[in-house]
C-alpha cells in the first residue's frame, strides 16, 4: 500500500540533488585554495541533516547551524555585491571583476544556487515530487530558511562600501519583500558599513530617465539612512557596455557613465 504523501504547491527537490551538492562542493574546493580543508562529505551530511526527517514547514535557522559552521568562509568584507531580481548580471559582473563577491560566489551560496530541496516528517526520504511554496504553503521551508540564514550572515559580514545591483525593469526596483529588502538591508552593521551604493540596471532599451529618483529607491534610501548608513545611487544605463567596460576599463568609450 503506497503511503500518503503531502502534496505541496512548489516544485519538488531538484533531481540528483545529493550528487549535485557533493559535486559542486568538490569543484568549489578545488577552485578555491582557501577552502581546500573542507570535507565535502561532512558538508553534505550537515546539509542533509538540516531538512531530512523534518516537517518541511517547520525548518529553523538552527537546523542549518552545523552546515553554516562547516561552510564558514572569509570574503573581503569591503568587496561584497548584493543583488535583487537581477542575479545573472550580478554573477556576470563578479566573473569579470574577480575581487568582488556575491553570495553565490561563496561556498554555501554556490552549493544551493538554483536548487530546490525538502524532506518529509519522520522519513529519511527526499521529496522529489513537490516542496512547499513560500507564498502558497509556508515561509519556514528548507529553501527559504537556508537563503534567509546565509543572506543574513553575508550581510552581517559586510563592511565599508557595500554595493547592490537592482533591476530597473521591475515595477518595484527596490522590493521590501525581496531577500535583499527583508533580510540583507536590516542586517548590514552600521558600525562597519559606511555606505550602501545601489546600481540601478536599466533594461535593454535605451533610456535617459534617472531611475535613482524612483519612489522605491527613495524608500530604500530612507531605510538605510535611518540605520545610520550613507546611501548613494547610480544608473547603469547600458548593462552590456557596463560589463564590457569592466572587462576593458582602458577602452576610450568607457569614460562616460554607463
Amino acid at each position: 500500500v503506497p503511503r500518503w504523501r503531502q502534496q505541496w504547491s512548489g516544485p519538488g527537490t531538484t533531481k540528483r540533488f545529493p550528487e549535485t551538492v557533493l559535486a559542486r562542493c568538490v569543484k568549489y574546493t578545488e577552485i578555491h585554495p582557501e577552502m581546500r580543508h573542507v570535507d565535502c562529505q561532512s558538508v553534505w551530511d550537515a546539509f542533509k541533516g538540516a531538512f531530512i526527517s523534518k516537517h518541511p514547514c517547520n525548518i529553523t535557522e538552527e537546523d542549518y547551524q552545523p552546515l553554516m559552521k562547516l561552510g564558514t568562509q572569509t570574503v573581503p568584507c569591503n568587496k561584497i555585491l548584493l543583488w535583487s531580481r537581477i542575479k545573472d548580471l550580478a554573477h556576470q559582473f563578479t566573473q569579470v571583476q574577480r575581487d568582488m563577491f556575491t553570495l553565490e560566489d561563496t561556498l554555501l551560496g554556490y552549493l544551493a544556487d538554483d536548487l530546490t530541496w525538502c524532506g518529509e516528517f519522520n522519513t529519511s526520504k527526499i521529496n522529489y515530487q513537490s516542496c512547499p511554496d513560500w507564498r502558497k504553503d509556508c515561509s519556514n521551508n528548507p529553501v527559504s530558511v537556508f537563503w534567509k540564514t546565509v543572506s543574513r550572515r553575508f550581510a552581517e559580514a559586510a563592511c565599508d562600501v557595500v554595493h547592490v545591483m537592482l533591476n530597473g525593469s521591475r515595477s518595484k526596483i527596490f522590493d521590501k519583500n525581496s531577500t535583499f529588502g527583508s533580510v540583507e538591508v536590516h542586517n548590514l552593521q552600521p558600525e562597519k558599513v559606511q555606505t550602501l551604493e545601489a546600481w540601478v540596471i536599466h533594461g535593454g532599451r535605451e533610456d535617459s530617465r534617472d531611475l535613482c529618483q524612483d519612489p522605491t529607491i527613495k524608500e530604500l534610501e530612507s531605510i538605510i539612512s535611518k540605520r545610520n548608513i550613507q546611501f548613494s545611487c547610480k544608473n547603469i544605463y547600458r548593462p552590456d557596455k557596463f560589463l564590457q567596460c569592466v572587462k576593458n576599463p582602458e577602452d576610450s568609450s568607457c569614460t562616460s557613465e554607463i
Epitope: R170, E206, S208, D210, D214, N235, S256, E257, I258
Partner: antibody, heavy 119, light 112 residues
C-alpha cells in the same frame, strides 16, 4: 496611418475633472514603450506633463503637474489615460499623447484633445 | 528645469533657398550615458507635431535628407538645405536628457 487615437474635445467647468484617453493601435509596442502626455497652450508652447510605462505602471510627472495630473494605462485595451483634476481656465489647452519611438524620444503623436475650461 | 531658447522667432524663405534655426539650452544636454537628447519637431498648421531629427543629427524615418541637425553641449542647429512649400509650420527643439522634458518656444517658417 493613425497609430494613436485620442478622445474628442471636452468642455468642463472650473473645479471639475476630466479623463482623456489615448488608444494605441500598435499592441506589440504599447506595453513596453513610455507614453508621454504633453499640453500646448496658445502662446505658451509645449509643456511635458509626464509619462507612463504601461507594463509595469512606472510613472514620471513633471513637478508642475504632480498634483494636477494622474496617469494610468490599460494593457488589455492598449489605452493610456490622463486625468486632470481641479480644473481652472489655466488648464485650457490641447493635450497630446505621444509614444516614444526610441528611448526617451517622442516619435508618434496623437491628434490631440482640446480641453476648454469655462464657467 | 532646462530652458530651451530658439532663434529666430520667425523666418521667411524663398523656395529652394536654405534655412537655419538655432536652439540653445540652459545647461548641457550631454547625458551621462553618452547620448545627447536634443530633438527637432515640426508642427504643420492644424496638425500634431512630427519628429524630424532625434539625438542632434539623426533623421527620423520618412524625413527628407534636406533636413539635417548638428551641435553639441548647449548649442544646436537645424538646417534645411532647400526649403519647399510643404516645409511651412512651426519648428520646435526639445530636450529629453533631463526630466522634465522641455521644448523651445518655436520658430515659424513661412514661404516668401
Amino acid at each position: 496611418q493613425v497609430q494613436l487615437q485620442q478622445s474628442v474635445s471636452e468642455l468642463r467647468s472650473p473645479g471639475s475633472s476630466v479623463k482623456l484617453s489615448c488608444k494605441d493601435f500598435d499592441s506589440e509596442v504599447f506595453p513596453t514603450s513610455y507614453m508621454s502626455w504633453v499640453r500646448q497652450k496658445p502662446g505658451h508652447g509645449f509643456e511635458w506633463i509626464g509619462d507612463i510605462l504601461p507594463n509595469i505602471g512606472r510613472i514620471f510627472y513633471g513637478e508642475k503637474f504632480e498634483d494636477k495630473a494622474k496617469l494610468d494605462a490599460d494593457t488589455v485595451s492598449n489605452t493610456a489615460y490622463l486625468e486632470l483634476t481641479s480644473l481652472s481656465s489655466e488648464d485650457s489647452a490641447i493635450y497630446y499623447c505621444a509614444r516614444e519611438a526610441y528611448g526617451s524620444i517622442l516619435g508618434y503623436w496623437g491628434q490631440g484633445t482640446l480641453v476648454a475650461v469655462s464657467a | 528645469d532646462i530652458v530651451m531658447t530658439q532663434t529666430p522667432l520667425s523666418l521667411s524663405v524663398t523656395p529652394g533657398q536654405p534655412a537655419s534655426i538655432s536652439c540653445r539650452s540652459s545647461q548641457s544636454l550631454l547625458h551621462s550615458n553618452g547620448n545627447t537628447y536634443l530633438h527637432w519637431y515640426l508642427q504643420k498648421p492644424g496638425q500634431s507635431p512630427q519628429l524630424l531629427i532625434y539625438k542632434v543629427s539623426n533623421r527620423f524615418s520618412g524625413v527628407p535628407d534636406r533636413f539635417s541637425g548638428s551641435g553639441s553641449g548647449t548649442d544646436f542647429t537645424l538646417k534645411i538645405s532647400r526649403v519647399e512649400a510643404e516645409d511651412v509650420g512651426v519648428y520646435y527643439c526639445s530636450q529629453s536628457s533631463h526630466l522634465p522634458w522641455t521644448f523651445g518656444g518655436g520658430t515659424k517658417l513661412e514661404i516668401k
